[in-house]
Amino acid sequence: EAHKSEIAHRYNDLGEQHFKGLVLIAFSQYLQKCSYDEHAKLVQEVTDFAKTCVADESAANCDKSLHTLFGDKLCAIPNLRENYGELADCCTKQEPERNECFLQHKDDNPSLPPFERPEAEAMCTSFKENPTTFMGHYLHEVARRHPYFYAPELLYYAEQYNEILTQCCAEADKESCLTPKLDGVKEKALVSSVRQRMKCSSMQKFGERAFKAWAVARLSQTFPNADFAEITKLATDLTKVNKECCHGDLLECADDRAELAKYMCENQATISSKLQTCCDKPLLKKAHCLSEVEHDTMPADLPAIAADFVEDQEVCKNYAEAKDVFLGTFLYEYSRRHPDYSVSLLLRLAKKYEATLEKCCAEANPPACYGTVLAEFQPLVEEPKNLVKTNCDLYEKLGEYGFQNAILVRYTQKAPQVSTPTLVEAARNLGRVGTKCCTLPEDQRLPCVEDYLSAILNRVCLLHEKTPVSEHVTKCCSGSLVERRPCFSALTVDETYVPKEFKAETFTFHSDICTLPEKEKQIKKQTALAELVKHKPKATAEQLKTVMDDFAQFLDTCCKAADKDTCFSTEGPNLVTRCKDALA
């Protein structure tokens, strides 16, 4: 229903705390360079205004749209052009063009320093002094670095953060309590970020239709006892929620997500037997829990998929009468039978089925033509299964760091023109798939591996889009989202690449590397590895292993030496010479 004042309506629905958090996230995601204090001031002004509208919905400007209100606030920021360049041009436009202009200027890779965690004592002191400001800083710092982070989920992570600090700051050894717990939240939040960015990419490039197909497959796997009408309703609602968040309508998104969670909990009987535990939780935890709830037990009496989609004499008639609905039921039926497949694979199978019907239903004898369609799925299923087996075997053999290095070599050979920092970031993220997925039971590995890889490769595509340098990457990123991962996997050494000349300074290290945290040391070594491959794209695995072992030995020796500086300055050039010889 229409409300006299949209801002009053959302304030009432969400409550002050969530309202303020979401407005802060929205501003931080739009204007990523502004300080926390600048945004906090705007948030307070918007909140005070919302309260006046709650008191009197007819008050001046209360009938304005949220985009108009928020956009006017952002455009009133002083020195907008100096700080944001052409983003300031958005302010010359009217709504809704202005908001969509802001959206198009969101930066997936803002030049902001990494979000450093203060040491435990300092963190606990500032948390105790002002928990609200502390959490505000967290929302601001995450949101500006991840401009598409799923806003209601970010509120959930802030709540987790809050609970961890409340618990650990009361302990004697704050550090050992905080570190593992906060590391866990950070890891989950980073995965959440790339997954949501993939959803927004799908919406932006391929539309709601593509996202809804993704949602139907995913929901059908999780809720195999729900009927098609129920799955369609959930998919439609979930599409609306994600569309709103991806479009910057964060208050509507959070409100509608809460409504969806409420609906699911009120209709457990027709959805799934596994929801009760989630439904007993408070709002943010409930919605988060529902989003990753375990799959319901599959009905025991499901007929073979062939009955309705291959053997039925009316296949072409049913398809012609309502293509979207017929393909939707196919995707639903296939997905509910295959919780062990990735959503990407299920969508590829549905695409193959559609292409087969398009071709066969135009022929003289359609059933003879589409009769073998399920057998034709086999190679499409085998390819990701082999990928999982090969990569998990390699991960088990090498461990996470070694596995990341193997991926780094592979991807540098596929796309040597891509910047080294991007290749290292991608390889490190891709390599984490081992730790994340390879330890899972067999039937959960494929969906975990492929859907995670797809999300990481989406980020590679977004970064490459800004400065396209590799035809290989452009080719894979231009196709449909579900074909990206197979496209990247199929890439081989880029034969068009002219190797980089050997620069000694690229491989020259100093004693400061010794005091770096382990993660930073790894990044330094991986940067050197990518540069080696760019210098010798056809180096064998054995050659690269020799060089990297030598390099590790050099670091170990010099970092243990009494006079580190001398060791680095004398042994460094020897290492460079040995590298050149080993790769000659």
Partner: nanobody
Amino acid sequence: QVQLVESGGGLVQAGGSLRLSCAASERAFSHSNMAWFRQAPGKEREFVAHIHWRGSTTYLDSVKGRFTISRDNAKNTVYLQMNGLRLEDTAVYYCAADSARRILVTVSTSYDYWGQGTQVTVSS
């Protein structure tokens, strides 16, 4: 291949009304999002109004309350009712269809199909 054909343009006095129509050649139209854009001489193409396949609407601020977008799925047609026309509404009006239902509605690259345009001239 979807074809879009606009009609209803013409010359009208300031304050007057016109109703533009856009007929689509395919049934798939009912699942597409539709929009009207306009282009005045020497200016960029500008978004005017959008209607989601389920019926929700979005308007450019300066036409809100004056223009109404609607659709008749049985006739595969989308309409733009323009009241209280102003001199600055003079432009070629284009109908556009987005079969994928993309997220950015004011951006012309979100649309797969375009009509050839119909001229609207508002005189004083």
